[in-house]
């Protein structure tokens, strides 16, 4: 199969300005490509084929180009409809791959994190598991690490993350990071931390509780 | 306004068997080709099978052929993707795809919103 890999994966960028993102096949794809633009909860939209060509209805402002392997998608001054995801997909062979996407997101002014750190309920304990929450609120940019230390142990592999969109007023982000486990395991220890590095904090920042005493 | 809507995805155990269908309204989709995508979390948006016009038959990624069947009935204007032998691997949101023209352009001017397959093992 023919791979699609675009860059970046994330672009920060202002009203007005002319954005590029890149896409290069893993073959020569001739000229057969497409890009598309998807919002959050939306189909995505055809935007542009035959790496140039643009799709009905679609503004000037998007401009293709390329061929081969390189090509590139320019919006040329950015309209606020215009912060999404978009996808560039090849059509030159029969298993029509899709690129992994360029999110264009707001460029905001970096903002540190307010941390929080929430046990499990009584009434979630009764069902057998136990969900630790640390909570991440209104950080730019998105990149953020969450460790999670039991007993100042850390842990790995038994937490999920989760980050909401983009704040549409101040552009930040939230981010959630759930760490599962066993009623018993929970259970076996005291001492339950959440740290989080942000570009924001001059250190990390670290949350915890002692089981039993909250 | 063409829509898509796609139907029957669920849980099912692994080597089991799902019927998914996409109906369309606002376009006769006999002239068009329909596809089927999929994507699981992380991961590209991926080619499954193509129902080309009636008569021009079908095509499969590597990884559903010989356990996908993908089936259009143009008069209740539906394609039908048939997925036996299912994997923790096949995994994903299931979506269709209209061909933007008649002639097999491989672009898609509208989507489904997608229906949840989860195999587990």
């Known amino acids: 199969d023919i791979q699609m890999t675009q860059s970046p994966s994330t672009l920060s960028a202002s009203v007005g300005d002319r954005v590029t993102i890149t896409c290069r096949a893993s073959q020569s794809i001739n000229t057969w490509l497409a890009w598309y633009q998807q919002k959050p909860g939306k189909a995505p939209k055809l935007l542009m084929y035959k790496a140039s060509s643009l799709e009905s209805g679609v503004p000037s402002r998007f401009i293709g180009s390329g061929s081969g392997t390189e090509f590139t998608l320019t919006i040329s001054s950015l309209q606020p409809d215009d912060f999404a995801t978009y996808y560039c997909q090849q059509y030159n062979s029969d298993s029509k791959m899709f690129g992994q996407g360029t999110k264009v997101e707001v460029k905001g002014t970096v903002a540190a994190p307010s941390v929080f750190i929430f046990p499990p309920s009584d009434e979630q304990l009764k069902s057998g598991t136990a969900s630790v929450v640390c909570l991440l609120n209104n950080f730019y940019p998105r990149e953020a690490k969450v460790q999670w230390k039991v007993d100042n142990a850390l842990q790995s592999g038994n937490s999920q993350e989760s980050v909401t969109e983009q704040d549409s007023k101040d552009s930040t982000y939230s981010l959630s990071s759930t760490l599962t486990l066993s009623k018993a395991d929970y259970e076996k220890h005291k001492v339950y931390a959440c740290e989080v590095t942000h570009q924001g904090l001059s250190s990390p920042v670290t949350k915890s509780f002692n089981r039993g005493e909250c | 306004q063409v829509q898509l809507q796609e139907s029957g995805g669920g849980l099912v155990q692994a080597g089991g068997s799902l019927r998914l269908s996409c109906a369309a309204s606002?376009?006769?989709?006999?002239?068009?080709?329909m596809s089927w995508f999929r994507q699981a979390p992380g991961k590209e948006r991926e080619f499954v099978a193509v129902?080309?016009?009636?008569?021009?038959?079908?095509f499969y990624s590597d990884s559903a052929e010989g356990r996908f069947t993908v089936s259009r009935d143009d008069a209740k204007n539906t394609v039908y993707l048939q997925m036996n032998s299912l994997k923790p691997e096949d995994t994903a949101v299931y979506y269709c795809?209209?061909?933007?023209?008649?002639?097999?352009?491989?672009?898609?001017?509208?989507w489904g919103q997608g229906t949840q397959v989860t195999v587990s093992s």
């Open positions: 129902a080309r016009r009636s008569g021009d038959g079908a």
């Open positions: 606002g376009r006769t989709i006999s002239r068009y080709a």
């Open positions: 795809a209209i061909d933007s023209s008649t002639d097999y352009t491989g672009t898609y001017d509208y």
